[in-house]
Interface confidence: low
């Protein structure tokens, strides 16, 4: 167990043209925060992939406050050193990302505004208990210098925290086979006890009561040497004809990630690939807490008092993400129905109805004929969220205020004359039609393909069309 | 390419609201200040306000009393609003954009409103 | 409030001429100053940020300079389309102030 430690000593513009304008003024208040994500090995993952070591936030810096007529300075700094303590073995090898975030200050709507300035990233190569190692990293015009250290917490010592010291039980010497723990020469080193059992020629342990297998053995005490000729399946059953051996219990049997953390299988071991928040070699542990801030934009921060319990960010309306980071479109949803227009006013959800339906999601569907009259013996009829007429004979238009032309639309066929009439209209068909709308052609012998013609008319005669 | 697109009422009597709004077209609406500006006919430029694409404003206490400024970053707009307006209000009213420590860098106008206040 | 004292009110000057308006700030404004170019019934359009910088598409005959408190803006041969007023304006603190204005007239 231990402390990676990083302290910021400055941040600012680099050296060279085009030197970044500063993010804060008088007329812009602000503040910097700092934020250290670790990964074990030289791994370049994407800033988003978990931070496995760990990571910290520290304080919010002082206000910046710019003397005028002076040059762009470096901006003020939190004070105090960003601490990501690792409660397993320091790897030697690790990742970082460092980000300096800006934290605007005045009203602000749902809270302050952050934003990202700059974001560095390196892979280096580390022993515990060194010195002080020095860095310069440049984003952009920006260039950020620290320092940083990882240092084993007592009882652990070395290079990966992995020894342990105590007391010397005589002031002369070590129990047999123990160093004196350097740089601590009062201390002794502690044996490791591994799992009883654990072979001393295949196994190993980095923990107390655990046993690790090297390469080509396997099983619970690393007793069992892993066959290299080809067997049905990785964990197949035994066979005496192909002389397979069942290996153990896989490393990731059982799955010892714990919070969620997904297990892949290493050579030697496992590896846990842990959710955002936690790190440790199991996914124990929790890097940060509620007491870091790492809520943005409002959120809520709940659970997380201890290094060893997780937190959880509770977002505002309009903001998602584990650190509730990421806007979000609530429109994309689609949430105004029937055809209404999304409005995403940050703090709201406002829907803009189209005609004929009304409600926060544009839900209701108004009644289209309520108050609607339809003049001149005209009936209402709904329909698509606007309301229509259904006219009486002889009248049109959208409420039944306009006298039709019942003519318009020629309704008299082969030729025949159309008359308005009070009552509709009248068709005077041509010689050789009849009908009510001369649809019907007269047969050459005098007979109709109709039944006679009603008394007092003529098959020439105008028919009135009732 | 960055259009400023503004529209509103022009003529206003006493004491009523004065209410315009500007469209951004073509650009990113975050980081950078939301500006209005007047000029009233044949004087010089007066700086009313701003605001944030987060909602920051900040407004000349010569009028903060009676002006507010709105964003509505889901449609890119932001508005203008000026409350008991007299004769003196009397101005082509201007959006624009600035940029964050940029050193007044207005690089972006909207094509001005006059705004006549008259009994 | 910064003032900003522009000087002169105004100028006639010919095409060719090297014109040069200044203005003042009544406290140290480090180059947070930009001048502007108005022509009448037109929006003001930026030629100059960060009291030095020329901005994108702004032809190289105009040109600025100072720090904290004294600034000038220089055109070096005066056009035909160079005939309009001058603003000068900080942004260094609350509230933003414009200069008064310097209307370049042809002589």
């Known amino acids: 167990a231990g402390v990676f430690e990083l302290q910021i000593h400055s941040f600012g513009p680099g050296p060279g043209p085009g030197a970044p304008r500063s993010p804060c003024s008088a007329r812009l208040p602000c503040r910097l925060f700092f934020r250290v994500c670790l990964k074990p090995g030289l791994s370049e993952e994407a800033a988003e992939s978990p931070c496995a070591l760990g990571a910290a936030l520290s304080a919010r810096g002082p206000v910046y406050t710019e003397q005028p007529g002076a040059p762009a300075p470096d901006l003020p700094l939190p004070d105090g050193l960003l601490q990501v303590p690792f409660r397993d073995a320091w790897p030697g090898t690790f990742s970082f990302i460092i980000e300096t975030w800006r934290e605007e200050l005045g009203d602000q709507i749902g809270g302050p505004a952050w934003s990202l300035l700059a974001r560095v990233a390196g892979r280096r190569r580390l022993a515990a208990g060194g010195p002080w190692a020095r860095d310069i990293q440049r984003a952009g015009a920006w260039e950020l210098r620290f320092s940083y250290r990882a240092r084993c917490e007592p009882p652990a010592v070395g290079t990966a925290c992995t020894r342990l010291c105590r007391p010397r039980s005589a002031p002369s010497r070590c129990g047999p086979g123990l160093r004196p723990c350097a740089p601590l020469e009062d201390e002794c080193e502690a044996p490791l006890v591994c799992r009883a059992g654990c072979s001393p020629e295949h196994g190993f342990c980095e923990q107390p009561g655990e046993c690790r297998c090297l390469e080509g053995w396997t099983g619970p005490l690393c007793t069992v040497p892993v066959s290299t000729s080809s067997c049905l399946s990785p964990r197949g059953p035994s066979s005496a004809t192909t002389g397979c051996l069942v290996p153990g219990p896989g490393p990731c049997d059982g799955n010892p990630c714990a919070n969620g953390g997904s297990c892949s299988e290493t050579p030697r071991s496992f590896e846990c690939t842990c959710p955002r928040g936690f790190y440790g070699l199991r996914c124990e542990v929790s890097g940060v807490t509620c007491a870091d801030g790492p809520c943005f934009n409002g959120g809520l921060c709940v659970g997380g008092a201890d290094p060893d319990s997780a937190y959880i960010c509770h977002c505002p309306p309009g903001f998602q993400g584990s650190n509730c980071e990421k806007r979000v479109d609530r429109c994309s949803l689609q949430p105004c129905r029937n055809g209404g227009l999304c409005l995403d006013l940050g703090h709201a959800l406002r829907c803009r109805c189209r005609a004929g339906f009304a409600g926060p999601r544009c839900e209701h569907d108004l009644d289209d004929c309520a108050g609607r009259a339809c003049a001149n013996g005209g009936t209402c009829v709904e329909g698509g969220g606007a309301h229509r007429c259904s006219c009486a004979l002889g009248f049109g238009g959208r409420d039944c205020r306009e006298r039709a032309d019942p003519c318009a639309a020629r309704p008299c066929a082969h030729g025949g004359r159309c008359y308005a009439h009070f009552s509709g209209l009248v068709c005077a068909c041509a010689p050789g039609y009849m009908g009510a709308r001369c649809e019907f052609p007269v047969h050459p012998d005098g007979a109709s393909a109709l039944p006679a013609a009603p008394p007092g008319l003529r098959p020439g005669d105008p028919q009135r069309y009732l | 390419q960055v259009q400023l697109q503004q529209w509103g009422a022009g003529l206003l009597k006493p004491s009523e609201t004065l209410s315009l709004t500007c469209a951004v077209y073509?650009?990113?609406?975050?980081?950078?200040?939301w500006t209005w500006i007047r000029q009233p006919p044949g004087k010089g430029l007066e700086w009313i306000g701003e605001?944030?694409?987060?909602?920051?404003?900040n407004y000349n206490p010569s009028l903060k009393s009676r002006v507010s400024i709105s964003v509505d970053t889901s449609k890119n707009q932001f508005s203008l609003k000026l409350s008991s307006v007299t004769a003196a209000d009397t101005a082509v009213y201007y959006c624009?954009?600035?940029?964050?420590?940029?050193?007044?860098?207005?690089?972006?106008w909207g094509q001005g409103t006059l705004v006549t206040v008259s009994s | 409030a910064i003032q900003m004292t522009q000087s002169p009110s105004s100028l006639s000057a010919s095409v060719g001429d090297r014109v040069a308006i200044t203005c003042r700030a009544s406290?140290?404004?480090?180059?947070?100053l930009g001048w502007y170019q108005q022509k009448p019934g037109k929006a003001p359009k930026l030629l100059i940020y960060a009291a030095s910088s020329l901005q994108s598409g702004v032809p190289s005959r105009f040109s600025g300079s100072g720090s904290d408190t004294d600034f000038t803006l220089t055109i070096s041969s005066l056009q035909p389309e160079d005939f309009a007023t001058y603003y000068c304006l900080q942004d260094y603190d609350y509230p933003l102030t414009f200069g008064g204005g310097t209307k370049v007239e042809i002589k």
């Open positions: 406290q140290g404004i480090r180059d947070d």
């Open positions: 073509g650009g990113s609406f975050s980081g950078y200040y």
């Open positions: 624009a954009r600035g940029e964050y420590g940029s050193g007044s860098r207005f690089d972006y």
């Open positions: 605001i944030t694409h987060s909602g920051s404003t």
